[in-house]
């Protein structure tokens, strides 16, 4: 058992152009806090996988308000260490994930909003009990300086916190083969812990987790009398060359325990000791529960009260992910229908609707013709929600209430004279022109000059004109 400790020294804009002036958004002041997550091994782990070695959250830092004339190189940070206790052996190799979170304190409906500002992930080798390791990491435009270490908690000592200390039996020195326990010189390292179930009478060990048999005994746990053993006749503990050390294939061979679990043989079977966050016969099931606080950004943890049920995070609007860790660009989902403009206000989503549409998502097509009769025999045409009347001849205006002068637009070509008529208009054409709008010249031979044949028609083809 022991504690992983992380000390954040500074967090601020990285060097170079484009560095942000402030961690806060335009919505107002904010403050920072940090989350540390430890995962076993050096493998590339999904961001959503649980922090099997443990996780910790810092306190909130002081409130930061951007001073436009003087951006702070180092932002005000929470005080104190982040400490992640570990119950089992320190693995030595691990993934360290440090997240910097921003809590916006602007005048927002319902209170502050949290968002992930930066995340650094490092794969590291580190022995417990060693000095502080220092690091500088970039995350986008931000720079994080921090130190970390792993230390054992007594009575555990050693680089993996697996050796135990115990008081000296003799005042002068430790027992044979046992060293003094630094830093407690008056204590000695305890003998290594043998494989679980190793016979106390017939077995012993020199390394943790092994089970060596005394003369006359065999089996993985030294519980089988070795009547035909090749070890008979040997004095003292069996040697590896005689084959009396833990014989071959045992239930733990190949380590059936997943997710960093450690295997112990039991009579006729095996047992996995699972790291925090996992359970099951082979540590194959993630055992993070709501008690671990897995939901961020105001997410509510549902289920997972006991290890037999998985948890779900119900995320507030604007966040998603299995732990509500991802901010949603809600407008990217194009929630506004019928060409409406999407506005993400943080606390809510708004749609600004085009004319003729309404509703929270512009889903309602306003029937602009409803209750709007067009006068003088006009008919209402609904187009994109805009109310329009198609008026009968001689009338115009939005509702066909205005008497139109059909000659106002000078419809008669080539100097023809226009006369208003109850059914529309009549053109009296100037000499040499003909047609309803005087559009065709009359040739001297009396044949009107009709337009040329449309493309695709050969001379001699019957020509149709609309």
């Amino acid at each position: 058992a022991g504690v992983f400790e992380l000390q954040i020294h500074s967090f601020g804009p990285g060097p170079g152009p484009g560095a942000p002036r402030s961690p806060c958004s335009a919505r107002g002041p904010c403050r920072l806090f940090f989350r540390v997550c430890l995962k076993p091994g050096l493998s590339e782990e999904a961001a959503e996988s649980p922090c099997a070695l443990g996780a910790a959250l810092s306190a909130r830092g002081p409130v930061y308000t951007e001073q436009p004339e003087a951006p702070a190189p180092d932002l005000p940070l929470p005080n104190g260490l982040l400490q992640v206790p570990f119950r089992d052996a320190w693995p030595g190799t691990f993934s360290l994930i440090i997240e910097t979170w921003r809590e916006e304190l602007g005048d927002q409906i319902g209170g502050p909003a949290w968002s992930l500002l930066a995340r650094v992930t490092r794969r590291r080798r580190l022995a417990a009990g060693g000095p502080w390791a220092r690091d500088i990491q970039r995350a986008g435009a931000w720079e994080l300086r921090f130190s970390y270490r792993a230390r054992c908690e007594l009575p555990a000592v050693g680089t993996a916190c697996t050796r135990l200390c115990r008081p000296r039996s003799a005042p002068s020195r430790c027992g044979p083969g046992l060293r003094p326990c630094a830093p407690l010189e008056d204590e000695c390292e305890a003998p290594p812990v043998c494989r679980a179930g190793c016979s106390l009478e017939h077995g012993f060990c020199e390394q943790p987790g092994e089970c060596r048999c005394l003369e006359g005994w065999t089996g993985p746990l030294c519980m089988v009398p070795a009547s035909t053993s090749s070890c008979l006749g040997l004095r003292g503990p069996s040697s590896a060359t005689t084959g009396c050390l833990v014989p071959g294939p045992g239930p733990c061979d190949g380590n059936p325990c997943a997710n960093g679990g450690s295997c112990s043989e039991t009579p006729g079977s095996f047992e996995c000791t699972c790291p925090r966050g996992f359970y099951g016969l082979r540590c194959e099931v993630s055992g993070v529960t709501c008690a671990d606080g897995p939901c961020f950004n105001g997410g509510l943890c549902v289920g997972g009260a006991d290890p037999d049920s998985a948890y779900i995070c119900h995320c507030p609007p604007g966040f998603q992910g299995s732990n509500c860790e991802k901010r949603v660009d809600r407008c990217s989902l194009q929630p506004c229908r019928n060409g409406g403009l999407c506005l993400d206000l943080g606390h809510a989503l708004r749609c600004r609707c085009r004319a003729g549409f309404a509703g929270p998502r512009c889903e309602h097509n306003l029937d602009d013709c409803a209750g709007r009769a067009c006068a003088n025999g006009g008919t209402c045409v609904e187009g994109g929600g805009a109310h329009r009347c198609s008026c009968a001849l001689g009338f115009g205006g939005r509702d066909c209430r205005e008497r139109a002068d059909p000659c106002a637009a000078r419809p008669c070509a080539h100097g023809g004279r226009c006369y208003a008529h109850f059914s529309g208009l009549v053109c009296a054409c100037a000499p040499g022109y003909m047609g309803s709008r005087c559009e065709f010249p009359v040739h001297p031979d009396g044949v009107s000059a009709l337009p040329a044949a449309p493309p695709g028609l050969r001379p001699g083809d019957p020509q149709r004109y609309l």
Partner: antibody, heavy 118, light 108 residues
Framework: QVQLQESGPGLVKPSQTLSLTCTVS????????WSWIRQPPGKGLEWIGY???????NYNPSLKSRVTISVDTSKNQFSLKLSSVTAADTAVYYC????????????WGQGTLVTVSS | EIVLTQSPGTLSLSPGERATLSCRAS???????LAWYQQKPGQAPRLLIY???SRATGIPDRFSGSGSGTDFTLTISRLEPEDFAVYYC?????????FGGGTKVEIK
């Protein structure tokens, strides 16, 4: 200004189904979670359940077998149905909006008293 | 579920005095997801504090919240006549959402 208004019968017979509707104004029902909470006369508050416009619901395990919450986005309303009521379900029923910063309640209706009696 | 226990049940004080209300959780409330409400007779509850210590919009600064883990406190620095009411705490760390039993602050 966000306003919530509960409506429904004030008297329900035992074994019947209690039905209430909450009409929301000043906020889009699609942008928040919405909840029901009740308070028996002279007692404390009890959360019943909540709903999101997408259909996500979560109910108090103590009432789960009897509760249904539904939402009608077109009317900006959400509703509560509580079946097989007994006198123990007599309470003031509140509808409330859940805040964006977490699952607490930032706006409440004024409440409606529902009495279960024959 | 997380059980919230409020104490004292009733607090008898005079205007101008300081009120300290306690809310204790049966399990640790992660990330300080705890809110406080005020309820006056015949009215709906009103949000005062969320996140254990953040004041809701429009709440006077005589109301303050503190605490973490399993122990939370609501403090009213100087009681005004309109502050005499029942106060409830609520956790929103995990489901089911639960309220404390309430503390009544009455005029002495």
């Amino acid at each position: 200004q966000v306003q919530l208004q509960e409506s429904g019968p004030g008297l329900v017979k035992p074994s019947q189904t209690l039905s209430l509707t909450c009409t929301v104004s000043g906020a889009s029902i699609s942008s928040f979670y919405w909840s029901w909470i009740r308070q028996p006369p002279g007692k404390g508050l009890e959360w019943i359940g909540y709903i999101y416009y997408s259909g996500t619901t979560n109910y108090n395990p103590s009432l789960k077998s009897r509760v249904t919450i539904s939402v009608d986005t077109s009317k900006n309303q959400f509703s509560l149905k509580l079946s097989s009521v007994t006198a123990a379900d007599t309470a003031v029923y509140y509808c409330a909006r859940i805040a964006v910063a977490g699952f607490f309640f930032d706006y409440w209706g004024q409440g409606t008293l529902v009495t279960v009696s024959s | 579920e997380i059980v919230l226990t409020q104490s004292p049940g009733t607090l008898s004080l005079s205007p101008g005095e300081r009120a300290t209300l306690s809310c204790r959780a049966s399990q640790s409330v992660n990330k300080n997801y705890l809110a406080w409400y005020q309820q006056k007779p015949g009215q709906a509850p009103r949000l005062l504090i969320y996140g254990a210590s953040s004041r809701a919009t429009g709440i006077p600064d005589r109301f303050s919240g503190s605490g973490s883990g399993t122990d939370f406190t609501l403090t009213i620095s100087r009681l005004e006549p309109e502050d005499f009411a029942v106060y409830y705490c609520q956790q929103y760390d995990r489901s089911p959402l639960t309220f404390g039993g309430g503390t009544k602050v009455e005029i002495k």
